[in-house]
Interface confidence: low
């Protein structure tokens, strides 16, 4: 495929990545799928600088990111190493709380109203952020 050199319409460029901020809500899996269909992924936060950028754009609203532990350990959707990477959890989070009465624990991470992260029930309909890297090969066929 051809290399993407600029961001799609309605996406925001920042530090060689493009970001799309939803204004509606979806369950985590649906948000994940939405981003994949856009040749992107749910946002992966790798630095304090990126955290501040995303936080500025989403405001004080619960918003899904590309971090989950549905198979056991916490994992970023793009394969970035969780254990050694940037983290911004609220104090005492993640806590895999079972007391919500919705069945199971909490396996998906979101930005909270103050920007710090919490784990929550993946079925909750939160806003989400998609991210795709510039300079990566897009899935579109090359122009002939």
């Amino acid at each position: 495929g051809s290399e993407r050199t600029c961001c799609p319409v309605n996406w925001v460029e920042h530090e060689r990545s493009c970001y799309w901020f939803s204004r509606s809500g979806k369950a985590w899996a649906d948000a994940d799928n939405y981003c994949r269909l856009e040749d992107a992924h749910l946002v992966v936060v790798t630095s304090w600088e990126e955290q501040k950028f995303v936080q500025h754009h989403i405001g004080p609203v619960n918003t899904w990111m590309g971090l989950h532990d549905q198979n056991g350990p916490w994992k970023w959707v793009d394969g970035t190493d969780y254990e050694t990477g940037f983290k911004n959890w609220r104090p005492e989070q993640p806590d895999d709380w079972y007391g919500h009465g919705l069945g199971g624990g909490e396996d998906c991470a979101h930005f909270t109203d103050d920007g710090r992260w919490n784990d929550d029930v993946c079925q909750r309909p939160y806003r989400w952020v998609c991210e795709t890297e510039l300079d990566k090969a897009s899935q579109e066929p090359p122009l002939l």
């Epitope: 532990d69 056991g72 350990p73 916490w74 254990e83 959890w89 005492e92 806590d95």
Partner: antibody, heavy 115, light 107 residues
């Protein structure tokens, strides 16, 4: 500098109990998974248990499930392993290690189960 | 459970040799693999995490490669301080599991 220091090991009879502690410093304790890993004399490494930052996610190996309990006190930067119904095969050096990729390890504490 | 099979279980090598240790996972673990070095009477030390990332402070003579089920640890030029036992470990899923270890001895 990241430091993990285990304590609480010793000699105990089969069926007895022991509580191991791991004191941590040099990092934001409450945001990291912590683990216990053990090594029997002359043998390889065996993962024992894992606990998430907020203590919501806890996992055990089948060999200790129902006998060992992992816990943490984030206010004290401490990790614990309560070991009950100890068996001879639990004899090992017990290490605490940070993250599921075990990026930092303590020096270990020896637990000997023998009559 | 994911089984980790390390080979060889031991090897003899000389100072300056290039040494390669292999680790095979019984199922796909992406790049969630770490390598450790352990010397007698000491705690293991992390060398590689999320293959091929080198742990901070570890010399570049150590390198990791692979993805999925096949991984290798390479020591480009063996030095006296590198004679030790090496373990691989997967953290893709619980239970976390180790390879059986590879003892690197002086020829």
């Amino acid at each position: 500098e990241v430091q993990l220091v285990e304590s609480g090991g010793g000699l105990v009879k089969p069926g007895g109990s022991l509580r191991l502690s791991c004191a941590a410093s040099g990092f934001t304790f409450s945001t990291y998974n912590l683990n216990w890993v053990r090594q029997a004399p002359g043998k390889g490494l065996e993962w024992v248990s894992s606990i998430s930052g907020g203590a919501g996610h806890i996992y055990y190996s089948d060999s200790v499930k129902g006998r060992f309990t992992i816990s943490r006190d984030n206010a004290k930067n401490s990790l614990y392993l309560q070991m009950n119904s100890l068996r001879a095969e639990d004899t090992a050096v017990y290490y605490c290690a940070r993250t599921n990729g075990f990026d930092f390890w303590g020096q270990g504490t020896l637990v000997t189960v023998s009559s | 459970d994911i089984q980790m099979t390390q080979s060889p279980s031991s090897l003899s090598a000389s100072v300056g040799d290039r040494v390669t240790i292999t680790c095979r996972a019984s199922q796909d673990i992406s790049n969630y693999l770490a390598w450790f070095q352990q010397k007698p009477g000491k705690a293991p030390k992390s060398l590689i995490y999320a293959t091929p990332s080198l742990q901070s402070g570890v010399p570049s003579k150590f390198s990791g490669s692979g993805s999925g089920t096949e991984f290798t640890l390479t020591i480009s030029s063996l030095q006296p301080e590198d004679f030790a036992t090496y373990y691989c470990q997967q953290y893709n899923s619980y239970p976390l599991t180790f390879g059986g270890g590879t003892k690197v001895e002086i020829k």
